[in-house]
Interface confidence: low
């Protein structure tokens, strides 16, 4: 995807997991300058920001996934031990200054372990 | 539910001065870029200015530069716009407009329903 | 700095389809777009963000007869199952470094 100088890639869109994995939402990014990044995760229940950060300085994580996430330089971001409540859509915006800017959205669906599964 | 409430329009002569206010209510006010549109009568939407959350950057249409300045409180929840050397061509709804982002001036996803400027002798 | 073109008006019946159309200008195929819905005598209502490959985040609250597609340097709104409500003014709006650029509107007639 690209969009006034912010080119995002996406390499999968939509991700299975099963309850406690650790989960990796991959992004590759290229833009002008050092962008803010934003993940933000959308569901029934509606929408929050999950980080915020600058590649090179701390990330700015909210309450709701403190200890949850980490952050990568390239976008990226990793979820710790995830649960059923963590589906839903996951949304990272890249941003330039005061301009250019790229959405998009990574589809995670968590299902619990199912006895018949280990079988 | 997010709702931003703009006051301070009126009638104003040529020249002078005046300043918009914008109540937000309803989400993090202090963690958004904010912007100001406005719309000629019978005519289409027209961008302003915007500030970033924390009023470190601003930008303004060019037709506004250097007579508008955009402001913000976010400890009042509230966003300015002061207009000087006011013209009739200034005349419109002014609106106030929510970013989706903090940083990155993107598009809007609320609106207020505005406050009417005329300039007029 | 991006220009965005929109045919000043359309029509269609009540209950049928309407595909509105915003152009991009040359070199600006790649940027993406926001559609806001204006109704008579009301503020703006912002209702989707469109990539331009076609994917797209629709605002709180809008119905899926609202979708939004794209094909090279057009953008497009699809409103299915026309109802008298959507009839208004439709604006497409594109942001670049520090700027914001609206199209001049379509405003839609909802017949009969």
């Known amino acids: 995807l690209q969009s006034q100088g912010v080119s995002l890639y996406i390499p999968q869109a939509t991700i299975n997991a099963t309850v406690k994995e650790d989960i990796l939402l991959s992004v590759e990014y290229s833009c002008h300058g050092v962008p803010t990044i934003e993940w933000t995760y959308s569901s029934n229940w509606g929408t929050q920001k999950i980080v915020e950060w600058k590649p090179g300085t701390q990330a700015n994580i909210s309450q709701s996934h403190k200890d949850r996430v980490c952050t990568f330089d390239n976008g990226s971001i990793q979820l710790f031990s995830v649960g059923v409540r963590d589906s839903g859509y996951y949304v990272i915006t890249v941003t330039e200054r005061l301009g250019s800017s790229q959405f998009g959205t990574i589809v995670l669906h968590v299902s619990e372990i199912l006895y018949e599964d280990l079988h | 539910e997010v709702q931003l409430v703009e006051s301070g329009g009126g009638l104003v002569q040529p020249g002078r001065s005046l300043r918009l206010s914008c109540a937000a209510s309803?989400?993090?006010?202090?963690?958004?870029?904010m912007h100001w549109v406005r719309q000629a009568p019978g005519k289409g939407l027209e961008w302003v200015a915007v500030?970033?959350?924390?009023?470190?950057?601003?930008y303004y249409a060019d037709s506004v530069k250097g007579r508008f300045t955009i402001s913000r409180d976010n400890s009042k929840n509230t966003l300015y716009l002061q207009m000087n050397s006011l013209r009739a061509e200034d005349t419109a709804v002014y609106y106030c407009?929510?970013?989706?982002?903090?940083?990155?001036?993107?598009?809007?996803?609320?609106w207020g329903q505005g406050t009417l400027v005329t300039v007029s002798s | 700095q991006p220009v965005l073109t929109q045919s000043s008006s359309a029509s269609a019946s009540l209950g049928a389809s309407v595909k509105l159309t915003c152009s991009l200008s040359?070199?600006?195929?790649?940027?993406?777009i926001a559609w806001h819905q204006q109704q008579p005598e009301k503020g703006p209502r912002y209702l989707m963000k469109?990539?331009?490959?076609?994917?797209?985040s629709k605002g709180d609250g809008i119905p899926d007869r609202f979708s939004g597609s794209s094909s090279g340097a057009e953008r497009y709104l699809t409103i299915s199952s026309l109802q008298s409500e959507d009839e208004a003014d439709y604006y497409c709006?594109?942001?670049?470094?520090?700027?914001?650029?609206f199209g001049g509107g379509t405003k839609l007639t909802v017949l009969g």
């Open positions: 407009a929510k970013d989706q982002y903090s940083v990155g001036a993107t598009t809007y996803d609320y």
């Open positions: 309803g989400f993090t006010f202090s963690s958004y870029a």
């Open positions: 500030i970033s959350y924390d009023g470190s950057n601003k």
């Open positions: 040359s070199g600006h195929s790649s940027y993406a």
């Open positions: 469109l990539n331009s490959d076609g994917s797209h």
């Open positions: 709006q594109t942001w670049g470094s520090g700027i914001q650029v």
